[in-house]
């Protein structure tokens, strides 16, 4: 049985994909199905993720590479790897305790996830309000009441989009 | 679906040579050491030699060594057996095999005979 | 090289029979040991790895035990299409081995 053998660290010629046994001489050996091992010159083998309920494998473990997940439509990812799952919210709402709820007067949410933010001030820049915020679209601000003088042109925007069917908020 | 399928068997008379290939789908080769393992009519399953996944790292049966070179070729997503001075005893179907030995390909027979 | 030895070498049993089968290894595996099902003309079938874990879409009546040196594979109740070539194989070091065979036919 032919091998190569290092002058320095054996393990060091253990692949990825294998592991190094201590007491054995450190002889290589396979990880075993639904392990694996990234790097070279490991003592073990690691045990592959399983992406199981809420979970869908998004890349299939290999010998030398762990499994990644994700989440099954209606839930999105938080934490490193993604390492949890949280339910979608539609926009205009945030997730609390109880479930998703509306944001409240003043904030916005234009995503699935995440919590309701409050409108941008204005003023606070000196501008004014172009168009009104809602639960899912922050306030446009526009230039401020100053910079509307007699002879300056005016600018007229665009009336936000609305869904067919749905009334005016 | 994993599928691992060798080919590029035959009859070859001692003293020749064959290349084996095997052509592996449903999953990332590249990622996957391998392994080619044997088996001669009517005998139990003999291990041949290894691949690492990039294929650094090689291993070799005694009762091949120096007459078999195993490679790989990832971008072709394909595993190779170069077989030389062929014997008698050589006569198999020879198998090839993720690292994991969970999926294995249907073989292809090699005959050494005169 | 670990040199694993199995027995019985025939098995002769009815269907709804229980099955076991033994592998023993020259020297201590630790739990790298793996079960196989090869039926004629087919590749051999991954059903147990790591002595005791049954692979992916193996039905429950298979099960592994053992550790070091001594393991067995239990079949609970014997169905038809269990009938086949068992091989214990060991990767707990290269180079990799396997045992010669237990083959389970109908009584």
């Known amino acids: 049985f032919e091998r190569t053998r290092s002058l320095q660290d054996p393990c060091s010629n253990c692949p990825a994909g294998t592991f190094c046994d201590n007491n054995r001489n450190q002889i290589c050996s396979p990880c075993p199905p639904n392990s694996f091992s990234s790097a070279g010159g490991q003592r073990t083998c690691d045990i592959c993720r399983q992406c199981k309920g809420v979970f869908r494998t998004r890349k299939e473990c290999s010998s030398t590479s762990n499994a990644e997940c994700d989440c099954t439509p209606g839930f999105h990812c938080l934490g490193a790897g993604c390492s949890m799952c949280e339910q979608d919210c539609k926009q205009g709402q945030e997730l609390t305790k109880k479930g998703c709820k509306d944001c409240c007067f003043g904030t916005f949410n234009d995503q699935k996830r995440g919590i309701c933010r409050p409108w941008t001030n204005c003023s606070l820049d000196g501008k004014s309000v172009l168009v009104n915020g809602t639960k899912e679209r922050d306030v446009v601000c526009g230039p401020s009441p100053a910079d509307l003088s007699p002879g300056a042109s005016s600018v007229t925007p665009p009336a936000p989009a609305r869904e067919p069917g749905h009334s005016p908020q | 679906e994993v599928q691992l399928v060798e080919s590029g068997g035959g009859l070859v008379q001692p003293g020749g040579s064959l290349r084996l290939s095997c052509a592996a789908s449903g999953f990332t080769f590249s990622e996957f050491g391998m392994h080619w393992v044997r088996q001669a009519p009517g005998k139990g399953l003999e291990w041949v030699s290894y691949i690492s996944s990039g294929g650094s790292t090689i291993y070799y049966a005694d009762s091949v060594k120096g007459r078999f070179t195993i490679s790989r070729d990832n971008a072709k997503n394909s595993l190779y057996l170069q077989m030389n001075s062929l014997r008698a005893e050589d006569t198999a179907v020879y198998y090839c095999?993720?690292?994991?030995?969970?999926?294995w390909g249907q073989g292809t027979l090699v005959t050494v005979s005169s | 090289e670990i040199v694993l030895t199995q027995s019985p070498a025939t098995l002769s049993l009815s269907p709804g029979e229980r099955a076991t089968l033994s592998c023993k290894a020259s020297e201590n595996v630790g739990s790298y040991v793996s079960w196989y099902q090869q039926k004629p003309g087919q590749a051999p079938r991954l059903l147990i790895y790591?002595?005791?874990n049954r692979y992916t879409g193996i039905p429950a009546r298979f099960s592994g035990s053992g550790s070091g040196t001594d393991f067995t594979l239990t079949i609970s109740s014997l169905e038809p299409e269990d009938f086949a070539v068992y091989y214990c194989?060991?990767?707990?070091?290269?180079?990799?081995?396997f045992g010669g065979g237990t083959k389970v036919e109908i009584k």
């Open positions: 194989g060991q990767s707990y070091s290269y180079p990799l081995t």
């Open positions: 790591g002595a005791s």
């Open positions: 095999a993720r690292d994991w030995v969970d999926y």
